[in-house]
Amino acid sequence: RQQWELQGDRRCQSQLERANLRPCEQHLMQKIQRDEDSYGRDPYSPSQDPYSPSPYDRRGAGSSQHQERCCNELNEFENNQRCMCEALQQIMENQSDRLQGRQQEQQFKRELRNLPQQCGLRAPQRCDLEVESGGRDRY
């Protein structure tokens, strides 16, 4: 049993090293990176500029292309739930320093948890997405 777990860990490690998770990171960031000004109006100008792109028009072809490539990568972890979780944790770790707001962090986590499902894959049952290194803020 221990031997099998050790081999399983090694297999997961090599899978993670082979995988290119960037498309997943790009897809998720595009998904949550709506116009941040919708979180709070710029005090410099009272009204929304009519020429400003809509906060919700951010999903274009680029994002669906990233999603497709992301799902292809996540597919490699379909038969190993623990390894799927590690892949998700790696994505969270790689992007955590980009998220300088609690709402953004929570939104990213939510989207990340839904990612396997979006790809038609089984989501890991228990997967802690807290980032230990760098000391993320927690309440």
Partner: antibody, heavy 118, light 110 residues
Framework: EVQLVETGGGLVQPGGSLRLSCAAS????????MHWVRQAPGKGLEWVSA????????YYADSVKGRFTISRDNSKDTLYLHMNSLRAEDTAVYYC???????????WGQGTLVTVSS | IVLTQSPLSLPVTLGQPASISCRSS???????????LDWFHQRPGQSPRRLIY???KRASGVPDRFSGSGSGTDFTLKISRVDAEDVGVYYC????????FGQGTKLTVL
């Protein structure tokens, strides 16, 4: 409406200390990273320091590391900058700014002037 | 990361276009695909105001005559038709590794 009001500036001697405050209103203060940026008279902008929403992560420019300390009190919606061992080159208008949530400086205060001179 | 702006002084005739360059000492593209480069405008005696974020996204309330472009190490802020209210200093800022500003470009109207 988002408002950031800096206070605590003034005249201080070289080697002295000062504490700046930034009172925030109009948004959920404890949801955002906050920054201090300064501008010496007639010069450009210089990013000084930032603190994450819960205060766990603190970032400093090399020019102030070890001398300045950033902190926040989320129960009072207030950001602080504790400045020690002040030098003449620290003379500047100090602005408090709120992060957009994606590492961009979205809202700025009006600034408070710190003068270091003997 | 060091940001170098050019020109440092930019005299422009009203209604004419203007362009400011910002060059970074290293690429500002994060692995998530975004360029962490913002542009700010500071009018005399006022606080800075954000114009552009993520290299090309126009901030809310900013007139469409302002546009940002570029990727990696070379970025440009363009004003299609300069207005009297556009005078002041323009700064680029990187947010890839902590935060740093360019030295500023002073725009004056002829």
């Amino acid at each position: 409406e988002v408002q950031l009001v800096e206070t605590g500036g003034g005249l201080v001697q070289p080697g002295g200390s000062l504490r700046l405050s930034c009172a925030a209103s109009g948004f959920a203060f404890n949801d955002y990273t906050m920054h201090w940026v300064r501008q010496a008279p007639g010069k450009g902008l210089e990013w000084v320091s930032a603190i994450s929403y819960g205060g766990t992560n603190k970032y400093y420019a090399d020019s102030v590391k070890g001398r300045f300390t950033i902190s926040r009190d989320n129960s009072k919606d207030t950001l602080y900058l504790h400045m020690n061992s002040l030098r003449a080159e620290d003379t500047a208008v100090y602005y408090c700014a709120r992060d957009s949530g994606y590492r961009s400086l979205l809202h700025w205060g009006q600034g408070t002037l710190v003068t270091v001179s003997s | 990361i060091v940001l170098t702006q050019s020109p440092l002084s930019l005299p422009v005739t009203l209604g004419q276009p203007a362009s400011i360059s910002c060059r970074s000492s290293q690429s500002l593209v994060h692995r998530n695909g975004y360029n962490y480069l913002d542009w700010f405008h500071q009018r005399p005696g006022q606080s800075p105001r954000r114009l552009i974020y993520m290299a090309s996204k126009r901030a809310s309330g900013v007139p469409d005559r302002f546009s940002g472009s570029g990727s990696g190490t070379d970025f440009t802020l363009k004003i299609s038709r300069v207005d009297a209210e556009d005078v002041g200093v323009y700064y680029c800022m990187q947010a890839l590794q902590t935060w740093t500003f360019g030295q500023g470009t002073k725009l004056t109207v002829l």
